[in-house]
């Protein structure tokens, strides 16, 4: 979380960002709040990228003027134009591209005052891992995959009744390039897995974590899984 | 100022389908919701749901699930709403519009449906 | 669903009167409401967008109040161009909601 000032004359305003993560090919969105101002036409939001020159987005007298906009930001980015007015200047990020990592500058001027606030965005990708019995290996096995991952993480196994132990020797993990030759896939094999217990898979780079946690009884199957975000807000 | 331009009349027969445009100048399409709004003659104004341009998601009324399908066309600042199985129930003026901001309508459509 | 209750559903009023709309949400929707103008066989003209902001080229005389459940529309001074119906909507929580209208007569 970051909170700015700006001072103009003897007017500033708060604005507010929080560090966030974008996932590599889908949509993002940059976090930054204001101090509302209920004028729109008197509003005017920048956001700017360390070492890019021009801008990434600009929205004021209530729309877009990208004409000094970035050409690797061209097409990709819209403010929640609706909400401006209650003080919401997030960015929202179409795509987006490992190369979108950096330092951001949400800039804010209103009839109140001028204020900016930095904001660290991670890029990278993380994924929801999924725990399935492995019918086909010689032994009981659970196999946890993860379509997505960058950069590479750390796989571990854990369960509710050997808390604890350490599971390396009994565990392999592999990691496989996926098709845009970036990302990877994640598959951990847990062998000599035993009935009426708890099994947790857990991923994590940088920037997430994520486990999934499967329950294997002689009736049923449970499972559940989280992702959680590194270092955010 | 915002310009929401909407497409023409239509006259429908019963069961048909129609799909009706909205095309918006002076403004970056992507960062408003587009709204659409329906008016029965002589009755109140009845959100049908909104299309965000930036995503192509999606919010409906319940009421008109399955009846309009909300999409865009980014490359033409275009919004559009298709109705299917047409019925009388669905005559009515539709409005594109903002809703909160920069607050415009579309000067309407008026889709009448009559065998 | 929220209920936006709008009052009075018409009215008639002099020139140069003070004229208040009301309406009434069924839950609290902070200030996420605007209010609407149409003339018959318009569209409708946006007058106040969240509850308080008067839009772009509104003349001075409406003005919007409330936040929460209750809200108001008031013409500090009835013209004749004021003749109408209006209409609030509430855009806090899906799915958005119309008041039924007050359709506005000068006497």
């Known amino acids: 979380l970051i909170i700015g000032f700006g001072i103009s004359g003897k007017h500033f305003i708060t604005v507010t960002t929080f560090t966030s993560a974008g996932n590599i090919g889908e949509d993002g969105t940059l976090s930054c709040t204001f101090e509302p101002d209920i004028k729109l036409n008197g509003i005017v939001i920048q956001w700017l990228k360390e070492g890019i020159k021009g801008l990434v987005h600009e929205f004021k007298e209530g729309k877009d003027d990208l004409s000094q906009q970035h050409e690797m930001f061209r097409g990709r980015t819209a403010v929640f134009a609706d909400q401006v007015v209650v003080g919401n200047a997030s960015l929202r990020l179409k795509n987006v591209q490992l190369t979108d990592a950096g330092t951001y500058t949400c800039y804010i001027r209103t009839s109140k005052g001028k204020g900016n606030a930095n904001l660290e965005y991670k890029t990278g990708a993380f994924s929801m891992p999924e725990i399935n019995v492995d019918y086909n290996a010689s032994s009981e096995s659970l196999r946890c995959e993860a379509p997505r991952w960058f950069p590479q993480p750390t796989v571990a196994w854990a369960s509710q009744v050997d808390q604890g132990a350490n599971f390396s020797e009994v565990s392999n993990t592999s990691f496989e390039l996926n098709s845009e030759n970036v990302t990877m896939k994640v598959v951990s094999v847990l062998y000599n897995v035993t009935i009426n217990n708890t099994y947790s898979c857990m991923i994590e780079n940088d920037i997430a974590k994520a486990t999934g946690d499967i329950k294997v009884t002689d009736s049923e199957v449970k499972r559940r899984s989280q992702l959680q975000l590194l270092n955010s807000g | 100022q915002v310009q929401l331009q909407q497409s023409g009349a239509e006259l429908m027969k019963p069961g048909a389908s129609v799909k009706i445009s909205c095309k918006a100048s002076d403004y970056s399409f992507t960062s408003y919701y587009m709204h659409w709004v329906k008016q029965s003659h002589g009755k109140s104004l009845e959100w049908v749901g909104y299309?965000?341009?930036?995503?192509?998601?999606?919010s409906y009324n319940q009421k008109f699930k399955g009846k309009a399908t909300l999409t865009v066309d980014k490359s033409s600042s275009t919004a559009y709403m298709h109705l299917s199985s047409l019925t009388s129930e669905d005559s009515g003026v539709y409005y594109c519009?903002?809703?909160?901001?920069?607050?415009?309508w579309g000067q309407g459509t008026l889709v009448t449906v009559s065998a | 669903d929220i209920v936006m209750t709008q009052s009075p559903s018409s009215m008639y009023a002099s020139l140069g009167e003070r004229v208040t709309i009301t309406c009434k949400a069924s839950q609290d929707i902070k200030s996420y409401l605007s209010w609407y103008q149409q003339k018959p066989w318009k569209s409708p003209k946006t007058l106040i967008y969240?509850?308080?902001s008067l839009a772009d080229g509104v003349p001075s005389r409406f003005s919007g109040s409330g936040s929460g459940q209750d809200f108001s529309l008031t013409i500090s001074s009835l013209e004749s161009d004021d003749t109408a119906t209006y209409y609030c909507l509430q855009h806090g929580e899906s799915p958005y909601t119309f008041g039924g209208g007050t359709k506005l007569e000068i006497k």
């Open positions: 299309v965000d341009p930036f995503n192509g998601g999606t």
């Open positions: 519009a903002f809703i909160a901001g920069f607050a415009n």
């Open positions: 969240y509850a308080t």
